[in-house]
Structures are given as C-alpha cells and as structure tokens.
C-alpha cells in the first residue's frame, strides 16, 4: 500500500491534518525533499551571521560571518573573531605569537617556524611572527659540480680551492655551533620556566571584551584549550 | 512570549453542558492549529481533536466525536470546547495546546483547566 | 490508531544517573516522534521533536533517538528538576496518539 505522501513533492508538506493533501510549506519554512510530513523552519542569520543565501521552500538559508569574523564548523555553525597575522586566538583574545613561532593567516593558531637543519639546510631568510623562516641551499648543494645547472666554473690553482674550503668549513662549523647553543639555550629556559613560572608570567590585562587585542605574546602551555576566545554559535 | 491561558477549574453538573475556553497571545492565533487533550487522574493523554482558526477546519478523535465541538472566537483569539451531556467520565483535565502544522509537535501547553462533573 | 506503548509506568534513578524511557509504536511512523515532560503541578512541557531534535531551551543533557517502531529518550546527568512523568507521542497519522507515561523517580 503507497503512501499518500509519497507523491509530495519538496517545497510541501503531507498535511495529515487535512486529509493528506499536499500544502505548501509556510513562510519561514521549508523542505528540500520529498514526502515530509512537515517543513523545517528556516535558519535564521542573527547577530554577529549574516545570510548568504536566503531560505527558499525547498532550500533553507545559508549564513557567513560579518566582516572581522570567520566561520567555523559544519554549515558555519559558529563565528570566530579573526585576529591579525602574527597573532592567534586564546581565551583572552588575540595574542602575538611567541618567538620562534608564526601565523600568516587572520585565523588559526601560531606554527613553529621550520627547522632547516632537520633538512640539512641552512637559513636564509628568518622568521617573524607573520612568517616562516625560508631555508636555503645545504653545504652539499654549494659544494662543486653538486648543480648540473651551474656552468662549470673556471680552473683555479690548488692553493685557493684549499683557502674556500678552510673558509666554508670554518662558516658550518660556527654555525652547527651557533644552532647547538640557541637549542641548548631554549631547553634550559623551557626548564626554568617549568620550574619558575612566577618569573615569567605576565602582569593581569584587563580587557574590554573578546575583541580586544593583547600585546602579551600567548605562549601557550601545551594544555591549554585552542580557540574559545571569540566564538558565536547560532 | 506564547501564552495559552486556561481557567483553573470548572465545575458542572452532570448532563448539562459546559464550555471550555483557551485564550492565545504571543503569536498569530490563526498560523497555528489548538489542539485539546484530556488526562483523568493519574492516567495518560488522549488527543480531542484540532482547529484550526483561520478557516476553523476540525478534526476529531472518533472517540470524542460526539461529546466535543471545537470552536473559535479569532477577534479574541480564543478557541473553545464545548462538552455536552458530561458525566463523571468527562471528569479530568484538559489541556489546549498549539502547533504549527503538518506533523509538528505540540511545541506550547495551557495550564490545564480541571473539570469536575458533579451534582 | 496507532497504538503507544511505554513498557516501563515508573523508573526510579539517583542524582547524576543517566537513564533512557522507551516508547514502541504499533506501527512505522517514519521518526515522527516527540517526547513531553510532564511535572507534578500539572505543567507539560515539548522536549524533544522529530525522535532527536532539542526543543528551544531544552537542556543539552536531554536526547531521543529510534527509528520504525523503537524510540528511546535519554537523560544524561540527573538532576532535581528531572524527576517527572515523560510521554512520548506520535505525529504520523490522526488521531495524534500517546504513550502511558513513565514516571521518573527519586531513588
């Protein structure tokens, strides 16, 4: 036996409560398949969404976030505060990055710059708060004949092939130095930090609201929830 | 805010008629169908029927098709449910209740007005 | 008519139990079911429409779920205002049908 509601088509509704007929779904409603026996309110776009796509009998709306917001989860089910680049969102609002760390985006959270010695290379550009440190050519692909697109360089007498080499081992070696240190250096400031935190937190801020932007950097300790800040949801 | 005001008691005497009142504000009174249900004490709830006000289309329970008449007043926003020839049967509680259309839920409840059929 | 059951008339549960009523159609009603509290003074109230959609204002520690003829509701968490007589109800067909009601309990 076929169900009488079966033949309703989307934009209606099997209206039970006149005999099966087939109505149209009311304003501020709609169904987007067929045979429903009711019709889903519309979303509504308040406060801090805005409607991208007006609801329709057979579509309901769609929302995205005003300006200085930016959507979150499924159908844009939330909006976030956006925050500068270089800057992420905590529950305090949005922070600078920490040193050694960046965001290039007006949301997300702040990225370890990359470690180019991990690859073998060296750096040649480094990093800010905006942006990732930019790593250049390893020692290996400076040494000769490591580049097929190089034209080979002219002959040179022995004694000054040993000077460029003494020269370039001297520069790796002080450099290699120089990483070890500032690792060493970290490690011990993440340990005293552990073990000291009173001496490196940050004096109360007052803010005026989740919008409001913090110069603190945020340094995050691992536990801390991401996000949170400035979050609507519908 | 939806309301939908009920008078507390009513009290009848058997075989005479009486006249239940469930008056709306909050909302367009003739978007949505008032609905009556009956719960005797300590028992569940039985659906009356339906209107709906702003063509007064009726629906009934085949149970309670020839006890209860379903009626609107739309300049007062009022719907009504008379009982006729009432006996200590009729003794319960019977609540309005609204919902939008199709199969929708009962999504606003009156207070309940409690009938009590007596000599 | 589509008959309502409830198999359970009383359930008894503590403070911050998680506990689920059942309700069982005699019929297919294609997930056109809605749960009511029901308070001592007489107040009744839509939690949960269209087996597991949250009625505005419902708290997030009420759920429904089912399908066919099965449904359930489910309280998370227990707390003092949810102890209460819970109906389930059908929206498919007329007459709009309900179950007997399952009264949750202090233990």
């Known amino acids: 036996l076929q169900d009488p509601c079966s033949n309703c088509p989307a934009g209606t509704f099997c209206d039970n409560n006149r005999n099966q007929i087939c109505s149209p779904c009311p304003p501020n409603s709609f169904s987007s398949a067929g045979g429903q026996r009711t019709c889903d309110i519309c979303r509504q776009c308040k406060g801090v969404f805005r409607t991208r796509k007006e609801c329709s009998s057979t579509s309901n709306a769609e929302c995205d976030c005003t300006p200085g917001f930016h959507c979150l989860g499924a159908g844009c089910s939330m909006c976030e505060q956006d925050c500068k680049q270089g800057q992420e969102l905590t529950k305090k609002g949005c922070k600078d990055c920490c040193f050694g760390t960046f965001n290039d985006q007006k949301r997300g959270i702040c990225r370890p710059w990359t470690n180019c010695s991990l690859d073998g290379k060296s750096v040649l550009v480094n990093g800010t708060k905006e942006r990732d440190v930019v790593c250049g050519p390893s020692p290996a692909d400076l040494s000769p004949g490591a580049s097929s697109v190089t034209p080979p360089a002219p002959a040179r007498e022995p004694g000054h092939s040993l000077q460029v080499l003494t020269l370039f081992l001297a520069l790796t070696s002080a450099l290699l130095l120089a990483l070890i240190f500032i690792t060493l250096l970290f490690s011990v400031l993440k340990w005293i930090r552990k073990k000291f935190p009173h001496i490196f937190k940050q004096p109360f801020k007052k803010t005026t609201g989740a919008a409001q932007e913090e110069d603190a950097c945020s340094c995050r300790c691992p536990q801390e929830e991401e996000g949170g800040g400035g979050g609507y949801e519908l | 805010q939806v309301q939908l005001q009920q008078p507390g008691a009513e009290l009848v005497r058997p075989g005479a008629s009486v006249k239940l009142s469930c008056k709306a504000s909050?909302?367009?009174?003739?978007?949505?169908?008032i609905n009556w249900v009956k719960q005797r004490p300590g028992q569940g709830l039985e659906w009356i029927g339906n209107?709906?006000?702003?063509?007064?289309?009726?629906n009934y329970n085949q149970k309670f098709k020839d006890k209860a008449t379903l009626t609107v007043d739309k300049s007062s926003s009022t719907a009504y449910m008379q009982l006729s020839s009432p006996t200590s049967e009729d003794s319960a509680v019977y609540y309005c209740?609204?919902?939008?259309?199709?199969?929708?839920?009962?999504?606003?409840w009156g207070q309940g007005t409690t009938l009590t059929v007596s000599s | 008519d589509i008959q309502m059951t409830q198999s359970t008339s009383s359930l008894s549960a503590s403070l911050g139990d998680r506990v689920t009523i059942s309700c069982r159609a005699s019929?297919?009603?294609?997930?056109?079911l809605n749960w009511y509290q029901q308070k001592p003074d007489g107040t009744v109230k839509l939690l949960i429409y269209?087996?597991?959609r949250l009625h505005s204002g419902v708290p997030s520690r009420f759920s429904g779920s089912g399908s066919g003829t099965d449904y359930s509701l489910t309280i998370s968490n227990l707390e003092q205002e949810d102890f209460a007589t819970y109906f389930c109800?059908?929206?498919?067909?007329?007459?709009?049908?309900f179950g007997g009601g399952t009264k949750l309990e202090i233990k």
């Open positions: 019929q297919d009603i294609s997930h056109y």
């Open positions: 209740t609204r919902f939008h259309y199709g199969s929708s839920p009962f999504d606003n």
């Open positions: 269209y087996t597991s």
């Open positions: 109800q059908q929206g498919h067909t007329l007459p709009r049908t």
């Open positions: 909050g909302y367009i009174f003739t978007s949505y169908w």
């Open positions: 209107i709906y006000p702003s063509d007064s289309y009726t």
